[in-house]
């Protein structure tokens, strides 16, 4: 009875077990009883990164930049090439296919966690004692201005959109 | 999975000959490539010959050819090998070995079963 399963990093062609091509090559001819698995390299803009039987290596992704992508990692012979995206955009998935521009947190929020090429912008409300009048991808909610401190009143209480107004302490007459 | 248990060595004068025998357990003995494979003492080991699963096809080290002789019963799960005009730089332990990969005769880490081994000594 011929084998029905192979070992580990060999494949059942023929009812005959052969070894798999390595990462990086791509199988040219199948073994026979007493001939080894032929493989060859990929070309420079191709990859296989498993070991295989596969007779085509896979074509390297392009990062287009027209899409706003640029290349974080060239590709090996082992590896595909990983895309990122340019400065003020991030990926609209995670295979990063194309980018988006990272969004701005409105007035009464503020920037948690600044964009990277990979995740946008989060934003969190200002909470009481703290402010933005800006819309920004980078700007945190400030804090209110403290009065006392320069020896004023509140004149005008803030919100989450603006800051406190300060005047000077009415004088008893 | 086969077991494989090796027989028929000895000491043997130069000149001598022999036959290994290499019984094999367990089932379809006839689709592993088998091989004799030796080691001299303090030496690697190393390729002697091979035969196909069929027997039709067998392979030699130049060192053993015209001498050495594989062969196999497939009907009794037996692997041979025949040794004549026997050297000293024949000493060794000889090992049987089975395969079901494709691969070149002598790549010895394509066997996947391997014998214990039966020590051939030739000495006067």
């Known amino acids: 009875e011929p084998p029905t399963a192979c070992r580990e990093k060999q494949y059942l062609i023929n009812s005959q077990c052969c070894s798999l091509c390595q990462p990086g090559q791509k199988l040219v001819s199948d073994c026979t009883e007493f001939t080894e698995t032929e493989c060859l390299p990929c070309s420079e803009s191709e990859f296989l990164d498993t070991w295989n039987r596969e007779t085509r290596c896979h074509q390297h992704k392009y990062c287009d930049p027209n899409l706003g992508l640029q290349v974080q990692q060239k590709g090996t012979s082992e590896t595909d090439t990983i895309c990122t995206c340019e400065e003020g955009l991030h990926c609209t998935s995670e295979s990063c296919e194309s980018c988006v521009p990272h969004r701005s947190c409105l007035p009464g929020f503020g920037v948690k966690q600044i964009a990277t090429g990979v995740s946008d912008t989060i934003c969190e409300p200002c909470p009481v004692g703290f402010f933005s009048n800006v819309s920004s991808a980078f700007e945190k909610c400030r804090p209110w201005t403290s009065c006392e401190t320069k020896d004023l009143v509140v004149q005008q209480a803030g919100t989450n959109k603006t800051d406190v107004v300060c005047g000077p302490q009415d004088r008893q007459r | 999975q086969v077991q494989l248990v090796e027989s028929g060595g000895g000491l043997v004068q130069p000149g001598g000959s022999l036959r290994l025998s290499c019984s094999a357990s367990?089932?379809?003995?006839?689709?592993?490539?088998m091989a004799w494979f030796r080691q001299a003492p303090g030496k690697e080991r190393d390729f002697v010959a091979a035969i196909s699963r069929d027997g039709t096809i067998t392979y030699y080290a130049d060192s053993v050819k015209g001498r050495f002789t594989i062969s196999r019963d497939n009907s009794k799960n037996t692997l041979y090998l025949q040794m004549s005009s026997l050297r000293a730089e024949d000493t060794a332990v000889y090992y049987c070995?089975?395969?079901?990969?494709?691969?070149?005769?002598?790549?010895?880490?394509?066997?996947?079963?391997w014998g214990q081994g039966t020590q051939v000594t030739v000495s006067s």
């Open positions: 367990g089932r379809a003995f006839n689709t592993y490539t």
């Open positions: 070995a089975a395969r079901r990969v494709g691969a070149v005769p002598e790549r010895e880490s394509a066997y996947e079963h």
